[in-house]
């Protein structure tokens, strides 16, 4: 539990966190276990300690070994061990098993591949992604923050995915790569282009001036759990939050699952004390998922 394996490639940055976590105010001392030699904290060193982190900028094969971190609170000292292995760069495309991070599984409705260990680094978007060493291109691949999203995942999307990013330390840039396998699960669920159940397109609803009224936007997106499925209202093409009228409020979407297994979401628009000017507005029910956007419009009329 308090000994952690870390690995990297020579000439790349490697940052390792002390497996023994403590409060951020605690002092952390790092040592090279074999020699009990203290790791310096000065950033001019290629290998230096920075609180909970041990930084190899860049790493060399000779850095391999066990590093001890001692986390010191005012009254307690607690020890952790980082087992670091630095490998030579592979001449060919194959990524050996010992360089692979944990395998992740995905399906059509959940195809996120997180870039391993990236939270330890000072990086800026976008990430570069490769599959079996080929740069990923095409609209199906979306690099978002620290993960990759694949649209319409198919079984042949399985494979080894490598993320590549730049770590910046005091103005100097260092490359980092990390690889993990992605497997595709064949699930019973599926997602469809959104189907709006209510309101009907170009519907008109009769309302009483001065009364309260509710408009329900209800849409279905397929079967089973959905990766992305949102239902919301717009007023004259604007988000409700951008429309500064406190009488008109949108409830958070409520998930519904019908007996036929359809995954649907309902979002209610509440209008208090209906006024004449509300009859002039265009109310758009929007349903959005990875397949696209569908819009139904409803207007209000006086009863």
């Amino acid at each position: 539990k308090f000994s952690k394996q870390s690995w990297g490639l020579e000439n790349e940055a490697l940052i390792v966190r002390c497996p023994r976590q403590g409060k951020s105010s605690y002092i952390v001392d790092w040592y090279y276990s074999q020699t009990n030699k203290s790791i310096p904290t000065q950033e001019r060193n290629r290998v230096f300690a920075s609180g909970q982190l041990l930084k190899f900028l860049p790493a060399e094969v000779a850095d391999s070994g066990i590093y001890t971190c001692i986390v010191r609170s005012p009254t307690f000292n607690r020890t952790g061990y980082a087992n670091v292995t630095i490998y030579k760069k592979q001449p060919d495309c194959n990524v050996p098993d010992y360089l692979m991070y944990s395998t992740v599984s995905g399906s059509e409705k959940n195809s996120k591949i997180y870039c391993p260990t990236i939270d330890l680094y000072n990086w800026t978007a976008p990430l570069e992604w490769f599959k079996n060493c080929q740069a990923l291109q095409g609209s199906r691949y979306k690099a978002h923050k620290s993960f990759l999203v694949i649209d319409n995942v198919m079984t042949d999307d399985a494979g080894d995915y490598t993320c590549k990013f730049i770590h910046n330390e005091n103005g100097a840039n260092y490359s980092v790569t990390a690889t993990r396998s992605f497997t595709v699960k064949d699930e019973q669920g599926f997602s469809l282009f959104p189907v709006i159940r209510a309101p009907a397109h170009n519907e008109t609803k009769e309302v009483e001036i001065g009364e309260n009224t509710n408009l329900t936007c209800s849409a279905c997106f397929g079967k089973g759990a959905q990766f992305l499925a949102t239902v919301q209202w717009q007023l004259n093409g604007n988000k409700i939050t951008d429309f500064s009228e406190p009488r008109i409020q949108q409830e958070e979407g409520q998930n519904q699952s019908f007996s036929n297994g359809l995954a649907c979401v309902n979002t209610v628009l509440r209008i208090a004390d209906v006024k004449e000017e509300d009859l002039l507005l265009r109310y758009d029910c929007l349903a959005l998922n990875l397949h696209g956007l569908r819009r139904h419009t409803i207007r209000l009329s006086r009863k």
């Epitope: 976590q21 403590g22 409060k23 009254t75 607690r78």
Partner: antibody
Framework: EVQLLESGGGLVQPGGSLRLSCAAS????????MIWVRQAPGKGLEWVST????????YYADSVKGRFTISRDNSKNTLYLQMNSLRAEDTAVYYC????????????????WGQGTLVTVSS | EIVLTQSPATLSLSPGERATLSCRAS??????LAWYQQKPGQAPRLLIY???NRATGIPARFSGSGSGTDFTLTISSLEPEDFAVYYC????????FGQGTKVEIK
Amino acid sequence: EVQLLESGGGLVQPGGSLRLSCAASGFTFSVYDMIWVRQAPGKGLEWVSTIRGEGGGTYYADSVKGRFTISRDNSKNTLYLQMNSLRAEDTAVYYCARDPWSTEGSFFVLDYWGQGTLVTVSS
Amino acid sequence: EIVLTQSPATLSLSPGERATLSCRASQSVDDDLAWYQQKPGQAPRLLIYDASNRATGIPARFSGSGSGTDFTLTISSLEPEDFAVYYCQQYNDAITFGQGTKVEIK
């Protein structure tokens, strides 16, 4: 000097309620996770509940879940234990204690304890 | 929950003798184990944390060892003030205590 002082114990009927307090001093209260531990007469120690520092996340032993509520007022340096639906088996000395280390999701030892307050549940 | 079993329930020894107390966990707790001493009418006092580290101010005659599921508290030479009840506590998964070992004067 770190001090923890429990109060609020006493005799209560089964099904009744009681609120224990623990006044802390001598350390930055809001930073530390705080714990209630109890000890039935002549028996061993039993962890009851933990509350995180600023985050305020709470954890309970199965034996008290749904009946007891741990809370804290960092502005008053005070820890509380609201005990509802009390049973005879809740009779014990209740100690408040400090966890000097924990980070979110982990637990550690208890380095300072109060002197305890006796709760007796009896008709 | 993780169950801690302490043995023996009672240990009868004379001052100056060596005391060996055992604590066994129902599943591995790594080194997330502590030992406490409790005297009648007092709150427990922390002796050992992380299985083998002495807490501040604890005399060197107290030592802890073990990891995983089997742990030992050793008092190398009992002093009169060491006669008390000793509890082990795990903090690997929430918190549980052993039922205690009473060290009494023979």
